[in-house]
Interface confidence: low
């Protein structure tokens, strides 16, 4: 499995954005496919759960993420993004996409860094 | 606006340390992670590492693990890249930028030479 | 790591003429990030996310690809686009950088 994210992103606080992961493998797309997102805060706090997929999507039923994040995938166009709803400034970090479609090997995991800014191009 | 001030040259001797600056202003400081880049003409550019202004996080590339240590001062919103055991394969242009979605910020670079 | 190869290393057009520059990947990447540089002046980035031109950047560029290879095209050649391009990788760790292709006005 090949993980595709973009290295970066930014978003201004409060809005909503897509964490952007595709993928690519040699195996179909099956019900064997799972997709596991997990953020690093970036003042180095213990790794948290974000979404989970399988058949079905699994949200945060506690934490940080709790009704903020939904899935925005389709997994028979190897798309794995989700969305993240009403971002706050703690939501800065790193964001990690995981896919496992067996019997491919598993790929590198992606990782998108996000800072969220008062107003996008640093006109803070 | 954004600016990554750097000096503009260095010249050490072979086999000492030397540390490079770089002050950030205009921008949240803790908000971007910050890179290194070593220029050599007619090599390209090589990618360092990077570090986490917010906890001091680093993230070196393998072939400069032992070369390279990147630090911080929030205070003086400053990074720091020293380079140990100096040779001349270390003469270079090294930039500190930081990396947004759409638009990379760059220092000017300090230009290092290594010569007795 | 990925090796990013460009082509041509060196090339001249004339004003008008349409340009193309390429970088190829050593394995399979999400997408290319490519730099303006002068002499002097610290790169410049270009295009971002593979086909994303950055702030004021004219609309006569574009970039396109996928997989292994990806390409920087000038739709018609202008006097201020002569300098060195470089593309980058950002799918794996560490990111690497092309060799460079230095764009020569004819």
């Known amino acids: 499995v090949e993980i595709y994210t973009s290295r970066v992103l930014e978003a201004v606080n409060g809005t909503d954005v897509r964490l952007k992961c595709t993928f690519s493998s040699f195996a179909p797309v099956g019900d064997a496919l799972t997709v596991t997102w997990n953020f690093r805060p970036l003042d180095g706090g213990p790794e948290q759960f974000v979404f989970y997929y399988h058949i079905d999507p699994f949200r945060p039923m506690s934490g940080r993420f709790k009704d903020r994040v939904v899935w925005d995938g389709n997994p028979e166009r190897y798309d794995a993004s989700i969305l993240l709803w009403k971002l706050q400034f703690d939501d800065n970090g790193t964001y990690t996409c995981q896919v496992k479609n067996p019997p491919d090997v598993d790929g590198v995991i992606g990782e998108i860094r996000l800072s969220v800014v008062h107003t996008v191009r640093f006109s803070e | 606006q954004v600016q990554l001030q750097q000096p503009g040259a260095e010249l050490v001797k072979p086999g000492a340390s030397v540390k490079l600056s770089c002050k950030a202003s205009?921008?949240?400081?803790?908000n971007y992670w910050m890179h290194w880049v070593k220029l050599r003409p007619g090599q390209g550019f090589e990618w360092?590492?990077?570090?986490?202004?917010?906890?001091?996080?680093?993230d070196y590339n393998e072939k400069f693990k032992r070369k390279a240590t990147l630090t911080v001062d929030k205070s003086s919103s400053t990074a720091y890249m020293q380079l140990s055991s100096l040779t001349s394969e270390d003469s270079a242009v090294y930039y500190c930028?930081?990396?947004?979605?759409?638009?990379?910020?760059w220092g000017q670079g300090t230009t290092l030479t290594v010569s007795s | 790591q990925i090796v990013l190869t460009q082509s041509p290393a060196l090339m001249s057009a004339s004003p008008g003429e349409r340009v193309t520059l390429t970088c190829s990947a050593s394995s399979s990447v999400g997408y290319m990030y490519w730099y303006q540089q002068k002499p002097g002046s610290s790169p410049k980035p270009w295009i971002y996310v593979t086909s994303n031109l950055a702030s004021g950047v004219p609309a006569r560029f574009s970039g396109s690809g996928s997989g292994t290879s990806y390409s920087l095209t000038i739709s018609s050649m202008e006097a201020e686009d002569a300098a060195t391009y470089y593309c980058?990788?950002?799918?794996?760790?560490?990111?690497?950088f092309g060799a460079g292709t230095k764009l020569e006005l004819k």
């Open positions: 205009g921008y949240t400081f803790t």
């Open positions: 360092i590492g990077e570090i986490n202004p917010t906890n001091g996080g680093t």
């Open positions: 930028t930081i990396y947004t979605t759409a638009l990379d910020y």
């Open positions: 980058q990788q950002w799918s794996s760790n560490p990111p690497t």
